[in-house]
């Protein structure tokens, strides 16, 4: 048999071999495919079948518009003008090219040694779906999992049966000071049919900087609080990416999962104490915020606030 | 909305002719499969012609066959049934379908023209 | 030519009750059959579409079915305004076939 690719919406003529140009003809064209259940044959004289699937006068067969329940196998036996059967076996299968993929939502630059989306791929219309590719600096980016990530997801149009690619690519750059090009490709992996490759981006890579400090922030402020309050304790840092932040209270670190506000709901004196919170980035190591002091006091009674001066005169330091 | 209205229904005398139309409205005319189903007093349905949306392929069943003729003018969004050498049995109801290709069946109908072969 | 043979020609039936309708086709026509409800006075209405596909604006109480060349419409619970005549066509041969029609009265 022979194999056929035909557009999607373009029409088709498959020639019925050995068939006589025009009649008296005898000919029989059968049908396989999503609009059939078995083999359907046609009648040479025509009927409700001609819309998608027509004996013309020369025997050949008119597909008028292929669709995607067109692919199958389509055969015709015919009698030659010597009286020997001819037959002819076709497999169709059709695709439709995507319009251009794109870049959506590609980054502005890309930080060293920690992981950056790159941005995502989508293609939009193919069939049959087809793959997207990621390239670096025009060479092919293979994913490892661990410094080249990809997510894909795959969406079929419920009716036109049309697929929608895409692709997430996630990296982790060695070193700053570089300007890699990125740049995705979709190919439908049909023979003679070159991918359609997006515009590339290029990309600053910089290495992480240093947090810019490491602020400590406690409400309420000056960290005076009735018992059976709620003390909020937010670590404020400028880096990126936000590093893991853990906590210290009287310089021993607390037993919890890494957040950068710490909540001390319902207090009590055994919450008492001088805390402050320990930043970790993957580069620069662990910083520290200055401390702050927690004080729990009957309502009415409160003490002067850290750093403030009492009615004796002098400078008090919790 | 789609719409189909027939009209050129009325009384003829056997042997006679008439020409039925069938103005259509709320839909790409030119995209479908037109047909004409007929409907006797008090009985079934029964298929009288087809053409497909360009107007080139015409169907009709034996009992029509050389007598009626069905075509189209896209142009007008129009459908039209020639009708000769009309005999007593071909007295019905009329009705204008839009489809009757395998991709839609008869999927809108017109109201129907009644067509009355008496002498 | 395809025969559609449709039984039974007359039903009759309560509000409320399950009813169902068969045509038999002579031959293969593989899914290409409509269903049409049609009142006194008017113009077939398509219930069903390719033997099992509901309309548009048709009331989930019509169903279609097929196994093999038996086709069988269904209404789950019958409805005063479901009281008509049901037509089955076959759509994938020339000439189209219509069944002989069921009529559905009240009991």
């Known amino acids: 048999g022979q194999n056929i690719t035909a557009r999607i919406g373009e029409p088709l003529v498959l020639s019925c071999k050995g068939a006589p140009k025009k009649p008296p003809q005898q000919l029989e064209w059968k049908l396989n495919t999503g609009r059939t259940e078995a083999w359907k044959v046609l009648s040479p004289q025509g009927g409700p079948w001609d819309s998608v699937a027509r004996i013309l006068p020369n025997g050949s067969l008119l597909l008028p518009a292929t669709g995607i329940v067109d692919e199958g196998t389509f055969r015709c036996r015919a009698t030659n003008r010597r009286g020997k059967e001819v037959k002819s076996n076709y497999r169709v299968r059709v695709y439709q090219i995507p319009g251009k993929p794109e870049i959506v939502d590609p980054a502005s630059e890309l930080t060293a040694s920690v992981p950056n989306k790159v941005g995502t791929c989508v293609s939009e219309g193919s069939y049959p779906a087809g793959t997207l590719s990621w390239h670096l600096d025009g060479k092919l980016l293979i994913p490892d999992g661990k410094e080249t990530l990809v997510k894909e997801e795959t969406r079929r149009h419920p009716e036109t049966g049309l697929f929608t690619l895409r692709s997430e690519l996630t990296v982790i750059p060695t070193q700053g000071g570089t300007h890699p090009t990125f740049s995705c490709s979709f190919s439908l992996g049909l023979p003679r049919r070159r991918p359609l490759n997006t515009a590339p981006i290029q990309l600053r890579v910089r290495e992480p900087g240093p947090p810019e400090g490491i602020q400590l922030l406690v409400e309420p402020e000056g960290g005076i609080v009735a018992p059976g309050g709620t003390v909020t304790l937010t670590c404020a840092i400028s880096a990126q990416p936000p590093p893991q932040v853990h906590w210290i209270k009287d310089g021993a670190p607390l037993p919890l999962a890494p957040s950068p506000v710490l909540l001390l709901p319902e207090v009590g004196h055994e919450d008492e104490g001088t805390y402050s919170c320990v930043a970790t980035h993957p580069s620069h190591g662990p910083q520290e915020s200055p401390p702050v002091s927690i004080r729990v006091t009957e309502t009415g009674d409160e003490g002067p606030a850290e750093g403030s001066v009492g009615e004796s005169g002098l400078g008090t330091l919790a | 909305e789609v719409l189909l209205v027939e009209s050129g229904g009325g009384l003829v005398q056997p042997g006679g002719s008439l020409r039925l139309s069938c103005a259509a409205s709320g839909f790409t005319f030119n995209n479908y499969w037109m047909t004409w189903v007929r409907q006797a007093p008090g009985k079934g349905l029964e298929w009288v012609a087809s053409?497909?949306?360009?107007?080139?392929?015409?169907y009709y069943p034996d009992s029509v066959k050389d007598r009626f003729t069905i075509s189209r003018d896209n142009a007008k969004n129009s459908l039209y049934l020639q009708m000769n050498s009309l005999r007593a049995e071909d007295t019905a109801v009329y009705y204008c379908a839009r489809g009757g290709d395998i991709t839609t069946g008869f999927d809108y109908w017109g109201q129907g023209t009644l067509v009355t072969v008496s002498s | 030519d395809i025969q559609m043979t449709q039984s039974p020609s007359s039903l009759s039936a309560s509000v409320g009750d399950r009813v169902t309708i068969t045509c038999r086709a002579s031959q293969d026509v593989g899914i290409y059959v409509n269903w049409f409800q049609q009142k006194p006075g008017k113009a077939p209405r398509r219930l069903i579409d390719r033997a099992t596909n509901l309309a548009d604006g048709v009331p989930s109480r019509f169903s279609g079915s097929r196994s093999g060349t038996d086709f069988t419409l269904t209404i789950s619970s019958l409805q005063p305004e479901d009281f008509a005549t049901y037509y089955c066509?076959?759509?994938?041969?020339?000439?189209?076939?219509f069944g002989g029609g069921t009529k559905v009265e009240i009991k």
């Open positions: 053409i497909d949306n360009s107007g080139d392929n015409t």
């Open positions: 066509l076959e759509f994938d041969e020339h000439p189209l076939t």
